[in-house]
């Protein structure tokens, strides 16, 4: 296995996932494509935790670019051994991967809490509240209850879809960073095994 190529593949995947996380989080601010609910502060409290923008997004770009950089051939050797610098780089990528695990973990936790609590909406009794908070997430299994939210239109579908996407993306990011921890440790211990002749596709 070529540890550097694997890291680069993980890095590129994380960039894509991070951008999707940022997009999903931004969409949470505009239920049904409307801006007024953000300005009126009629959005779920978990939208304001920036889990997709920060946790699954910006914080994920740091490890992503570190992983991508591992494939470069300009790693400095040490004590006359070229592979020593690459080993150090692989081991340092473990630290970057741990930052990624923290970011994606934050994204997953906040998305799960957002799903469990449900949206802030104008209920059928004309009150703005966390209508489904008392259901402990069971509203997710009973779509006939979603009409209890009268405003914003389709807010339950909107929240459930986007928080589910954040949960899934964060979960994938978490797994990829976990893989890179293992990859980085193995790459650091076993050495940078790729010769210039070897070509591996991820």
């Amino acid at each position: 296995m070529c540890y550097g190529k694997c890291a680069r593949c993980i890095g590129h995947s994380l960039v894509g996932l991070a951008l999707l996380c940022i997009a999903a989080n931004i969409l949470l601010y505009f239920p049904n494509g409307e801006t007024k609910y953000a300005s009126e502060n009629h959005l779920s409290r978990f939208v304001w935790f920036f889990s997709g923008i920060v946790g699954g997004g910006l914080l994920m770009l740091l490890p992503a670019f570190v992983f991508i950089g591992l494939e470069q051939d300009d790693c400095c050797g040490c004590c006359g051994h070229e592979n020593c610098g690459k080993r150090c780089a692989m081991l340092s990528s473990v630290l970057a991967a741990l930052i990624g695990i923290a970011g994606s973990g934050y994204c997953v936790i906040v998305a799960a809490l957002g799903l469990a609590e449900g949206p802030l909406c104008l209920d059928s009794l004309g009150q703005w509240n966390y209508t489904f908070a008392s259901t402990e997430g069971q509203y997710l299994l009973d779509t006939s209850t979603w009409s209890e939210c009268t405003e914003p239109k389709h807010i339950v579908e909107w929240n459930v879809s986007l928080f589910s996407i954040l949960l899934a993306l964060g979960g994938i990011e978490f797994i990829l960073c976990l893989i890179q921890v293992i990859n980085g440790v193995l790459g650091g211990i076993c050495g940078f095994c790729c010769s210039h002749q070897q070509q591996y596709d991820c």
């Epitope: 104008l122 209920d123 059928s124 009794l125 004309g126 009150q127 008392s134 259901t135 069971q138 009973d142 006939s144 209850t145 979603w146 009409s147 209890e148 009268t150 405003e151 914003p152 239109k153």
Partner: antibody, heavy 116, light 107 residues
Framework: EVQVQQSGPELVKPGASVKMSCKAS????????MHWVKQKPGQGLEWIGY????????NYNEKFKGKASLTSDKSSNTVYMELSSLTSEDSAVYYC?????????WGQGTLVTVSA | DIQMTQSPASLSASVGETVTITCRTS??????LAWYHQKQGRSPRLLVS???TLAAGVPSRFSGSGSGTQFSLKINSLQPEDFGIYYC?????????FGGGTKLEIK
């Protein structure tokens, strides 16, 4: 003071349609959800549907789909319910109720009598 | 649709007494239950929403309790204006459904 005023009684022939109104006053109309409820003489309450005048979000009881049609006019703070293809089964008092920050405010009801 | 079963269908009580009306639902509605009072020839009036939240202007002698599928409305120290029909109603999604009513009469 919050008030919900409904239109007067209606005597209509079978097969005809009727449109009743419900005018709200004393509060921000668009911050309320307006519900319609049917009550046959001497019987219980039956929910027809709701309309949120702020975004025209409408939800009907499956039983009244095709029978009732809810609309709103923000300029006059009025919601309307039209009942079509009337039969004797539709003879009842129809209540309009506004639900919002000041609680629930029910109209006095509109009596609809379907008779040949 | 969620079925609402009220009991008793009717009861007689004297002014000053305490009465309890119960409501059972066909599925778990958590705390999404409301109570109404209707006098003869009048519109229903909301008393309680979300099981125990008293509506504006409702006297403290009224209290709601319960959760899941079993709910009750308790009226302490009955007053002459409390007589009439009481309805329970779920507001856990749509369609809203009402109980058959409990007729409270003066003994």
């Amino acid at each position: 003071e919050v008030q919900v005023q409904q239109s007067g009684p209606e005597l209509v022939k079978p097969g005809a349609s009727v449109k009743m109104s419900c005018k709200a006053s004393g509060y921000t109309f668009t911050s309320y959800v307006m519900h319609w409820v049917k009550q046959k003489p001497g019987q219980g309450l039956e929910w027809i549907g709701y309309i949120n005048p702020n975004n025209d979000n409408i939800n009907y009881n499956e039983k009244f789909k095709g029978k009732a049609s809810l609309t709103s006019d923000k300029s006059s703070n009025t919601v309307y319910m039209e009942l079509s293809s009337l039969t004797s089964e539709d003879s009842a008092v129809y209540y309009c109720a506004g639900y919002g920050n000041s609680g629930a405010n029910w109209g006095q009801g509109t009596l609809v009598t379907v008779s040949a | 649709d969620i079925q609402m079963t009220q009991s008793p269908a009717s009861l007689s009580a004297s002014v000053g007494e305490t009465v309890t009306i119960t409501c059972r639902t066909s599925k778990n509605i958590f705390n999404f239950l409301a109570w109404y009072h209707q006098k003869q020839g009048r519109s229903p009036r909301l008393l309680v929403s979300h099981t125990k939240t008293l509506a504006a202007g409702v006297p403290s002698r009224f209290s709601g309790s319960g959760s899941g599928t079993q709910f009750s409305l308790k009226i302490n120290s009955l007053q002459p204006e409390d007589f009439g029909i009481y309805y329970c109603q779920h507001h856990y999604g749509t369609p809203w459904t009402f109980g058959g009513g409990t007729k409270l009469e003066i003994k």
